[in-house]
Interface confidence: low
């Protein structure tokens, strides 16, 4: 599998992974103890015909072209968890691995 | 996990799974021996704030609102394989399980 990496200076218009730091303090999410911020990344860009398509299905739907089908869109195709320390709804401190918090790769699906 | 199912008569505008039969013969894909057609389904519809969001990451990126971030899009969140009989590039007949050919569920990611 392959995915493009870009930054805010890139001129790449195709589907790409961009850096994004999520700052829980800036969001006012005070129930998160740690980390206060983390590198989440995000996906953005165009999904032209067969570029970075993750599944054969995407290509088939593009060919069949049903009414209302959006065509592929640039979305995470590989994600990873982070460990977090947070208060749950009962004000208990929980330490846990939260899945799908970091985008490792972007593709068209 | 939860996803909406729709058909061509549905008035649902949100992210939904729609039926789609892929016909390999109609595509001229004569290297596929069987099946000649199969139910692939596809995803279409709007992804409003937190509707059917698969990952917490999706919500966080929406909040951080980086330049050019796409927001969630309606895409397969669960897929399944089908068994296929086909000619490979060397004209050999192959029987194999092809992953991610059928959309079982759609969501916003």
């Amino acid at each position: 599998d392959f995915g493009l990496d870009c930054d805010e200076h890139s001129t790449e218009s195709r589907c790409c992974r961009y850096p994004l730091t999520v700052d829980f303090e800036a969001f006012g999410w005070d129930w998160i103890i740690a980390p206060k911020r983390y590198k989440a990344n995000y996906c953005s860009g165009e999904c032209e015909f067969v570029f970075l398509q993750k599944y054969p299905h995407t290509h088939l739907v593009h060919q069949a072209n049903p009414r209302g089908s959006a065509g592929p869109c640039c979305t995470p195709t590989k994600m990873s968890p982070i460990n977090m320390l947070y208060f749950n709804g009962k004000e208990q401190i929980i330490y846990g691995k939260i899945p799908a918090m970091v985008v490792d790769r972007c593709g068209c699906s | 996990d939860f996803g909406l199912d729709c058909d061509e008569h549905s008035t649902e505008s949100r992210c939904c799974r729609y039926p789609l039969t892929v016909d390999f013969e109609a595509f001229g894909w004569d290297w596929i021996i069987a099946p000649k057609r199969y139910k692939a389904n596809y995803c279409s519809g709007e992804c409003e704030f937190v509707f059917l969001q698969k990952y917490p990451h999706t919500h966080l990126v929406h909040q951080a609102n980086p330049r050019g971030s796409a927001g969630p899009c309606c895409t397969p969140t669960k897929m399944s394989p089908i068994n296929m009989l086909y000619f490979n590039g060397k004209e050999q007949i192959i029987y194999g399980k092809i992953p991610a050919m059928v959309v079982d569920r759609c969501g916003c990611s």
Partner: antibody, heavy 124, light 107 residues
């Protein structure tokens, strides 16, 4: 139905501040970005910035960044735009507008509902 | 910032006419263009988004087209209520920028 109702006209002196309010009804206020756009008399439209009521995160047009603050009060579903150090060329109608996100690709949204506008006159 | 150049700045037409207004961006805006109608003393009203999609409730006599840097709004058969000022807006990049407007007047 979805509605944005803005505060009444204001007359201010140069150097003063103005705070315009925009009260939302008929939808979940926290789920949609609110934008502010202004229009000087007989002129075109100018984007000032936006705010996400869910968390107060905002983006400002660099042209106003030093003088503008956008805030929200989720308990009353109201957005506010404060402009400081007013000058005569800030005389304009100020609009709030809701960003409707239809969500299939980058920047997939449009302004579906606008406030009626608030005339701010800056004059000595 | 992305500059949006709208033309013409004013236009005289008659009821029943077909009119075209154009908007040119200083760089590719990926079809992230909206069109608005504004009548005197009123807030703008969204007509078209994503270059060619019609906002719900807007009559089909309004249509949009274009890609890259060049976009067009067409009104197929002018009615008295269509005489107003029209603006384009790019929402591909912050800061959002509007065209300077086209005033459509009765001939």
């Amino acid at each position: 139905q979805v509605q944005l109702v803005q505060s009444g006209a204001e007359v201010k002196k140069p150097g003063a501040s103005v705070k315009v309010s925009c009260k939302a009804s008929g939808y979940s206020f926290t789920g949609y970005f609110m934008h502010w756009v202004r229009q000087a008399p007989g002129q075109g439209l100018e984007w000032m910035g936006n705010i996400y009521p869910y968390n107060g995160v905002s983006n400002y047009n660099q042209r106003f960044k030093a003088r503008v603050t956008m805030t929200t009060d989720t308990s009353t579903s109201t957005a506010y735009m404060e402009l400081r150090s007013l000058r005569s060329d800030d005389t304009a109608v100020y609009y709030c507008a809701r960003r409707y996100y239809y969500g299939t690709g980058p920047a997939d949204w449009y302004f579906d509902v606008w406030g009626q506008g608030t005339l701010v006159t800056v004059s000595s | 910032d992305i500059q949006m150049t709208q033309s013409p700045s004013s236009l005289s037409a008659s009821v029943g006419d077909r009119v075209t207004i154009t908007c040119k961006a200083s760089q590719d805006i990926n079809s992230y263009l909206s069109w608005f109608q504004q009548k005197p003393g009123k807030a703008p009203k969204s007509l078209i988004y994503r270059a060619n999609r019609l906002v719900d409730g807007v009559p089909s006599k309004f249509s949009g087209s274009g890609s890259g840097t060049d976009y067009t709004l067409t009104i197929s058969s002018l009615q008295p209520e269509d005489f107003a000022t029209y603006y384009c807006l790019q929402c591909d990049e912050f800061p959002l920028t509007f065209g300077q407007g086209t005033k459509l007047e009765i001939k």
